[in-house]
Amino acid sequence: NQDLPVIKCVLINHKNNDSSVGKSSSYPMVSESPEDLGCALRPQSAGTVYEAATVEVDVSASITLQVLVDTPGNISCLWVFKHSSLNCQPHFDVQNRGVVSMVILKMTETQAGEYLLFIQSEATNYTILFTVSIRNTLLFTLRRPYFRKMENQDALVCISESVPEPIVEWVLCDSQGESCKEESPAVVKKEEKVLHELFGTDIRCCARNELGRECTRLFTIDLNQTPQTTLPQLFLKVGEPLWIRCKAVHVNHGFGLTWELENKALEEGSYFEMSTYSTNRTMIRILFAFVSSVARNDTGYYTCSSSKHPSQSALVTIVEKGFINATNSSEDYEIDQYEEFCFSVRFKAYPQIRCTWTFSRKSFPCEQKGLDDGYSVSKFCNHKHQPGEYIFHAENGDAQFTKMFTLNIRRKPQVLAEASASQASCSSDGYPLPSWTWKKCSDKSPNCTEDIPEGVWNRKANRKVFGQWVSSSTLNMSEAMKGFLVKCCAYNSLGTSCETILLNSPGPFPFIQDSIS
């Protein structure tokens, strides 16, 4: 077809000088020479579709996909990736070819896929398809440990399918509540994969390698404890193993334990019992319910009953896919300069989330605490009273969640002033956002009380510190004002701050900085 444009598709690899995330054009990169991706017309496709060779990219590498179009006149374009439209700004090179680029910074799995470029020229419309994949490489992982029963023994094996092979340890505690915190003297750690002593109050297995530490608690119903106000709930994904331990203590051995799922006794082979005498000669019995690989029909109320204790239940919910439940509406807060304050997000999630708090492109560690109602909470207090936008981000592989917070710090304005040949400008942060007045200082008004009603332009702008607003006011200079002193004042409910400027001077002339509280 004569009308078809001459198209060249190229890949430009960049050597990153840094590995911070960002999509700005000023990203510090050194480029290698372009590699031709040989854009070929795709046969038997509806419309004109060019297909570039598949691009394989290392994780964290940065690349540019570029199309050079030899076609007369202007072109317009649109990138589409995973059903989202992305901005497209064509430009022309020295040979007057249209150039369209897509920069991918710090390649991740989420950026892999098909990139479609739609180009419209005066002569014709056509589509260019790029497929970007991650170069296959091995993965270091840290997976949450799970339990298996040891063959022919009443013991649990703790397994974490991780690389490098993790150090596995059991964390045991025989007291209640707070005293079972990690570094408490009541906590005993055993660096081994198999655990025979399964009668403890709190049993966890932890796996650690250079990626961190992951723990799994043995879900337990204790018939000697008062039941929680809300029914304990256990989430699992299809295919994961289920382990629930029922524990009861009685003055003698004359009692038994049974498990039921939705009022039906568990099948033979899905439970096992152990018993022992404690130091004070009371009998401890434990009964495990287990399913090596859960299916949807394993969902329901698991009830542990005893002939000598009130029965207790737990709700086991089997999900196909993990989730994060929380309200994602943005929240705005205003606080005083010395007021104590923490951001807080309450959520329910399975599997457990990884999270970060971000402010001004800096990430902070995120701690989460489990609540009694099955929810978790993450708090962030380390804002150091810096106003701006704070972002909570959580993910667990199946789901992602982001919540925005804005923090405003109530304070009196502080004015910065500057002057050019044609105008004077003042800016101020402060909160609430200040209003402005301009006054002229003259022989008639040595205290600068004469209002300047005209030529003033006010605006608010977002400063680099994300989410922090700055108000500015500009005075356009008339010939009549040159050589005069003027005063700009910013005021809000907490006070006023002023700056005095000599008009027609190259810089600020703040020989007086008034502060009227």
Epitope: L138, T141, G397, D398
Partner: antibody, heavy 129, light 107 residues
């Protein structure tokens, strides 16, 4: 550019202590696992220790366990190796090296395996009476 | 601990020769193996990661192969700048362990 610079080496008597530092620049230090590796004069490389990206997990070679402590200060982009009860056999050039970058991959915390890809120039520790 | 046995411990070769160095692990380490090059007075340099992946910026004459317990580093055509000591490192389990090294000298 990406750089690691070790410091703190020197001559020390057996039984004494020394602290090595490794200053990182040009990359997001707090996202990477970090290692110490040493090399005795005329000998091969010996891995010493690794610390996780957030600093809560450490692993050591048997030869240094209980005597050496690896730590990091992410706010200062610095890795440390505290060496106590030093012995003559600890005499070596000590290198710090960058490990993997933490990420979430298919729901699992992990990193793509690229080995120890960036090394410092080394700092010399001599243990002698 | 996993032992890494490297062979030969040294070899003499000429420019243009094909050179093969092997590394044997005492138990399976999947493909979690790196190859490093070290020149006197310098820090080691990563050549191959994950047993067979070439590190960015490393000449294509270097290649790695193997998985499980047997691994090989091959230099297809030895260049003057390749005379150095080469080490393998297993990163499958703690403690991490290096091979004893192979010194490649000029014949």
């Amino acid at each position: 550019q990406v750089q690691l610079v070790e410091s703190g080496g020197g001559v020390v008597q057996p039984g004494r202590s020394l602290r090595l530092s490794c200053a990182a620049s040009g990359f997001t230090f707090s996202s990477y696992g970090m290692h110490w590796v040493r090399q005795a004069p005329g000998k091969g490389l010996e891995w010493v220790a690794v610390i996780s990206y957030e600093g809560s997990n450490e692993f050591y070679a048997e030869s240094v366990k209980g005597r050496f402590t690896i730590s990091r200060d992410n706010s200062k982009n610095t890795l440390y190796l505290q060496m106590n009860s030093l012995r003559a056999e600890d005499t070596a050039v000590y290198y710090c090296a960058r490990g993997g970058e933490i990420t979430m991959v298919r729901g699992v915390i992990g990193y793509y395996y690229y080995g120890m890809d960036v090394w410092g120039q080394g700092t010399t520790v001599t243990v002698s009476s | 601990d996993i032992q890494m046995t490297q062979s030969p411990s040294s070899l003499s070769a000429s420019v243009g020769d094909r050179v093969t160095i092997t590394c044997r692990a005492s138990q399976s380490i999947s493909s979690y193996l790196n190859w490093y090059q070290q020149k006197p007075g310098k820090a080691p340099k990563l050549l191959i990661y994950a047993a067979s992946s070439l590190q960015s910026g490393v000449p294509s004459r270097f290649s790695g192969s193997g998985s499980g317990t047997e691994f090989t580093l091959t230099i297809s055509s030895l260049q003057p700048e390749d005379f150095a000591t080469y080490y393998c490192l297993q990163h499958n389990s703690y403690p991490l362990t290096f091979g004893g090294g192979t010194k490649v000298e000029i014949k």
